[in-house]
């Protein structure tokens, strides 16, 4: 035979190929050996022109020999040399992960090495490289960023030889959102109990706002911006009060139109309304909700109803906010004055959740027309908002 070559070399395999002998032969005898590796001999059919070498040692120079046999006759031997690849380290793992540190551990390759190349990269593209000694099987990473996804890779080195890289992915602990802009981000940070939280409008730490987060209704992550429950708070307030907000966030309150404008300007939000009365419950969800700025007189956008309470908010869509001292509704009379409340009145209301608590006179009370009509004041009502894509964010967090 002639033209002996090797191909497809890995750390444990290679493929030997040759040109067949001109004469017809019975068989070929292949043998291969390396330093500290006993010789292996195999006989293959005379029709064969390649042979897969397996169970090789990594990073080892092999000498490969082949000759042909026909009966008692043997051809001359041809020889080729090849070196197997350096095998990779194994089981790279990140442990003891903290906000700024992590410990990488691995098992060494079978081949002897002169060192390891460690590469770790954060999602923002920051890459760091470090070379460690041949006897090292762990390395402490420091100066990491909190709440950051990292990819760590390791490669074995032996002189000019380099193994394939293996990798592991980890996330440093700490807040996913150091300055959560709403209750959904607070929830994604791991806070799952309803109560008072500080959010930061537009994620700006200078724009802190204390809010009540509902972390249980339909998956949670809701900023509650209105609560009626006992009639202790006066909701017949003026324009200035409704712009700024009033009440106790743990009890009855209104978060404020300026805050609603700033929150809904952060992205696409959905509205949820929860109603409760003598053991009965109902809800309404609108998948698009926003409140304009003061120049628009806090114009309401509310679209895409689903729920059990009935679509009473559609009537108010596109309306500006009205109070007894700033009449922006489309009625000749002042709706806020007539119904002793404030709302995005038209002429006048199907929803009057800021009406007089417990007042069952027509249209005067806490009303949601398509649930309890205008002659029944609802005992408990909450209005709340969260990002429309919260379900996607929540799924991503669970996968992570």
């Amino acid at each position: 035979p002639s033209g002996l070559v090797t191909a497809n070399i890995t750390d444990s395999e290679a493929l030997a190929r040759w040109q067949p002998a001109i004469a017809t032969v019975d068989s070929y005898v292949i043998s291969y050996t390396g330093e500290k590796v006993p010789e292996i001999t195999r006989t293959v059919s005379g029709n064969t022109v390649e042979y897969a070498l397996t169970d090789l040692e990594p990073a080892t120079e092999y000498t490969l020999r082949i000759f042909a046999e026909k009966g008692p006759q043997k051809s001359s031997t041809i020889t080729a040399k090849f070196t197997t690849d350096l095998d990779s380290p194994r089981d790279l793992t990140a442990t003891e992960v903290q906000s700024e540190t992590a410990l990488l551990t691995w098992r060494p390759p079978r081949a002897s090495v002169t060192g390891y190349l460690l590469v770790y990269e954060s999602v923002d593209g920051t890459v760091k490289e470090v070379i460690v000694g041949p006897d090292t099987t762990s390395y402490s990473l420091a100066d990491l960023s909190p709440s950051t996804h990292y990819t760590a890779k390791i490669q074995a080195l032996n002189g000019p030889l380099r193994s394939n890289m293996i990798q592991t992915i980890f996330t440093t602990i700490g807040l996913l959102y150091p300055f959560p802009k709403d209750c959904s981000q607070a929830m994604l940070n791991g806070d799952t109990t309803s109560g008072l939280y500080t959010i930061y409008l537009n994620g700006d730490k200078a724009e802190a706002l204390e809010v009540f987060c509902d972390m249980t209704s339909d998956g949670g992550g809701w900023i509650v911006f209105l609560r009626r429950k006992n009639g202790r708070e006066n909701f017949y307030q003026n324009w200035k009060a409704y712009a700024a907000g009033f009440g106790d966030r743990r009890e009855e309150f209104w978060l404020g139109l300026d805050n609603l404008n700033k929150i809904t300007a952060q992205g696409q939000y959905e509205l949820r309304v929860d109603l409760r009365d003598h053991g009965e419950t109902a809800f309404a969800v609108y998948d698009k909700f926003s409140v304009g700025d003061a120049k628009t007189r806090y114009k309401l956008k509310v679209e895409g109803y689903s729920g059990t309470a009935g679509d009473s908010m559609a009537y108010h869509n596109g309306r500006s906010f009205s109070t007894f001292d700033k009449d922006t509704d489309s009625a000749i009379t002042n709706c806020a004055l007539s119904y002793k409340g404030a709302f995005w009145y038209r002429n006048c209301h199907r929803v009057n959740l800021m009406g007089r608590y417990g007042d069952n006179n027509h249209s005067q009370g806490v009303n949601w027309f398509h649930w309890k009509g205008h002659e029944h004041s609802i005992q408990f009502a909450e209005m709340k908002l969260r990002p429309s894509n919260f379900r996607n964010l929540e799924g991503r967090r669970k996968r992570a």
């Epitope: 679509d311 489309s330 002429n347």
Partner: antibody, heavy 120, light 107 residues
Framework: QVQLVESGGGLVQPGRSLRLSCAAS????????MHWVRQAPGKGLEWVSG????????YYADSVKGRFTISRDNAKNSLYLQMNSLRAEDTALYYC?????????????WGQGTMVTVSS | DIQMTQSPASLPTPVGDRVTITCRAS??????LNWYQQKPGKAPKLLIY???NLETGVPSRFSGSGSGTDFTLTISSLQPEDFATYYC?????????FGQGTKVDIK
């Protein structure tokens, strides 16, 4: 421009069925509730049925409940009224109308109507 | 169902006169009241919604007022093109109901 065009009216015997259609153009059809209103010859207006923008909620006058079915195909910008078990008192000009904003609201756009005559 | 009662049923009026049509609801409906004009052989046309809001393109001689149960449509100076039948309609609750109509004709 905004337009509603009804079709499907005609002469039908009592007890038979008819399906009215209304083709809408010039506005975002699925944003608005739609209604059918009828007017018997020489008489006033009578609301018949309504349907929300998504089609998820439907409403009927007592006089047609159980006999008429309102539906819509938002992909085709079309409103329908399936009328079964027709009676002589259903004879009227049937108008399709667009709701101004919410499901129960003013009707700001009307079609020209399609005549349904129920007679043996 | 809410009954809507219009008066008068017929109103012969000279051109240029002021016209007042009233509509009464059988129960309190806030301002959920609309007015329509219908000419013979034509579809109704929305004039006033929410008791007092003039629909786009409707002349300013038309106006609406009222709240609760009693409502009024006023034409400040009747023009020849205003001779028609006028209907009130409540959109407060389903079924939405119309008044029986008021025919304004030439005196």
């Amino acid at each position: 421009q905004v337009q509603l065009v009804e079709s499907g009216g005609g002469l039908v015997q009592p007890g038979r069925s008819l399906r009215l259609s209304c083709a809408a153009s010039g506005f975002t059809f699925d944003d608005y509730a739609m209604h059918w209103v009828r007017q018997a010859p020489g008489k006033g207006l009578e609301w018949v049925s309504g349907i929300s923008g998504s089609g998820g909620s439907t409403y009927y006058a007592d006089s047609v409940k159980g006999r008429f079915t309102i539906s819509r195909d938002n992909a085709k910008n079309s409103l329908y009224l399936q009328m079964n078990s027709l009676r002589a008192e259903d004879t009227a000009l049937y108008y399709c109308a667009k709701s101004y904003q919410s499901d129960e609201d003013a009707f700001d756009i009307w079609g020209q109507g399609t005549m349904v005559t129920v007679s043996s | 169902d809410i009954q809507m009662t219009q008066s008068p049923a017929s109103l012969p009026t000279p051109v240029g006169d002021r016209v007042t049509i009233t509509c009464r609801a059988s129960q309190y409906i806030q301002g959920f009241l609309n007015w329509y004009q219908q000419k013979p052989g034509k579809a109704p046309k929305l004039l006033i919604y929410d008791a007092s809001n003039l629909e786009t393109g409707v002349p300013s001689r038309f106006s609406g007022s009222g709240s609760g149960t009693d409502f009024t449509l006023t034409i400040s100076s009747l023009q020849p093109e205003d001779f028609a039948t006028y209907y009130c309609q409540q959109s407060y609750s389903t079924p939405q109901t119309f008044g029986q109509g008021t025919k304004v004709d030439i005196k």
